[in-house]
């Protein structure tokens, strides 16, 4: 037994009996210790939702998740988890995954708004887009619940000691 003490630099609700947190949803990358879409918070000693830090902190384990989050905020785009890239639906309408269904179906109803290559496709000129075909399998994005972010992660060590006391 011990405890945190002197610093050289200055210084809820009841749950039905057992609450179980299975250790599921790990990525195969680098034997992660936190589930996908979460990052290790060393001060709290737990896994936190990447959602809480996407806007203001670079956390390498959250990079892909934060990219996908910002991508999904852009209209007419979706995040391809295999390519790890933000894809424009306009470029793949006709071979689109379900994430682009709303965008592509609306575009197909109003040909005026279609890009030239798709207007050609609709008028019978088929362009060879073999590098796109079969690539988009419509991977579903599993969102994780936001956890309260720990305030003050960018503080100095002195300030951190105060925040966490």
């Amino acid at each position: 037994m011990s405890g945190l003490g002197r610093s050289r630099r200055g210084g809820r609700s009841r749950v039905d009996q057992e609450e179980r947190f299975p250790q599921g949803l790990w990525t195969g990358v680098a034997m992660r210790s936190c589930p996908e879409e979460q990052y290790w918070d060393p001060l709290l000693g737990t896994c936190m939702s990447c959602k809480t830090i996407c806007n203001h902190q670079s956390q390498r384990t959250c990079a892909a998740f934060c990219r996908s989050l910002s991508c999904r905020k852009e209209q007419g785009k979706f995040y391809d988890h295999l390519l790890r890239d933000c894809i424009s639906c306009a470029s793949i309408c006709g071979q689109h995954p379900k994430q682009c269904a709303y965008f592509c179906e609306n575009k197909l109803r109003s040909p005026v708004n279609l890009p030239p290559e798709l207007r050609r496709q609709r008028s019978g000129e088929v362009e060879n887009n073999s590098d796109n075909s079969g690539r988009y399998q419509g991977l579903e994005h599993r969102g994780s619940e936001a956890s309260p972010a720990l305030p003050g992660l960018k503080l100095s060590a002195d300030q951190v000691a105060l925040v966490y006391s």
């Epitope: 979460q38 000693g45 503080l155």
Partner: antibody, heavy 117, light 111 residues
């Protein structure tokens, strides 16, 4: 006074399971993560995983995936670790520890698990 | 995983002298202006006791003769003047990356 009281020693047969407990007191249970550490006889320490009573975040050492399961009972401020499919390699002392500000500041007294036929 | 290499594996120091234990990390454990390196003392049959956290801060009730230093990848635990009660195993431990990892330990004895 912060205390982490662990359950007593266990003698179990190979292939069996065991569930050990860590009852906490002296602080707000939901404010700290509880972690488990393995110490094989005369060896160093090995982190197994942790469980956060507050947000459900469960950092976990992939080496122990399929071996250890962590659960929490908020009503009694107790954390449990179940170890399954035990073999002689699982014979060790297992500690629970409270995590705060990047360190495990309070530790339980340890639970000895001996796997023997 | 971050690998921590402790040296020496064992150390015998006279009472009143300085004991220095080193710990080298395979990558930096610095995090927003802090170094997330901790030191534990362990006596036979007892749990580890936190003596230094965040590289240089003393744990609760830890005597002033224990001090820690270092940043990045290289850290030291100093005990001076050494007392009889300071014998035991000492482990460094990093918290920056999961999984948290421990050094192999240093056995400190009185010469």
């Amino acid at each position: 006074e912060v205390q982490l009281q662990q359950s007593g020693p266990e003698l179990v047969k190979p292939g069996a399971s065991v569930k050990i407990s860590c009852k906490t007191s002296g602080y707000t249970f939901t404010e700290s993560t509880i972690h488990w550490v393995k110490q094989s006889h005369g060896k160093s320490l090995e982190w197994i995983g942790g469980i956060s009573p507050n947000n459900g975040g469960s950092p976990f050492n992939q080496k122990f995936k399929g071996k250890a399961t962590l659960t929490v009972d908020k009503s009694s401020s107790t954390v449990y670790m179940e170890l399954r499919s035990l073999s002689s390699e699982d014979s060790a002392v297992y500690y629970c520890a409270k995590w705060v500000r990047g360190a495990m500041d309070f530790w339980g007294q340890g639970t000895s698990v001996t796997v023997s036929s | 995983d971050i690998v921590l290499t402790q040296s020496p594996a064992s150390l015998a120091v006279s009472l009143g002298q300085r004991a220095t234990i080193s710990c080298r990390a395979s990558e930096s454990v610095d995090y927003y202006g802090m170094s997330l390196m901790n030191w534990f003392q362990q006596k036979p049959g007892q749990p580890p006791k936190l003596v230094i956290y965040a590289a240089s801060n003393q744990g609760s009730g830890v005597p002033a003769r224990f001090s820690g230093s270092g940043s990045g990848t290289d850290f030291r635990l100093n005990i001076h003047p050494l007392e009889e009660d300071d014998t035991g195993m000492y482990f460094c431990q990093q918290s920056k990356e999961a999984p948290p990892t421990f050094g192999g330990g240093t056995k400190l004895e009185i010469k």
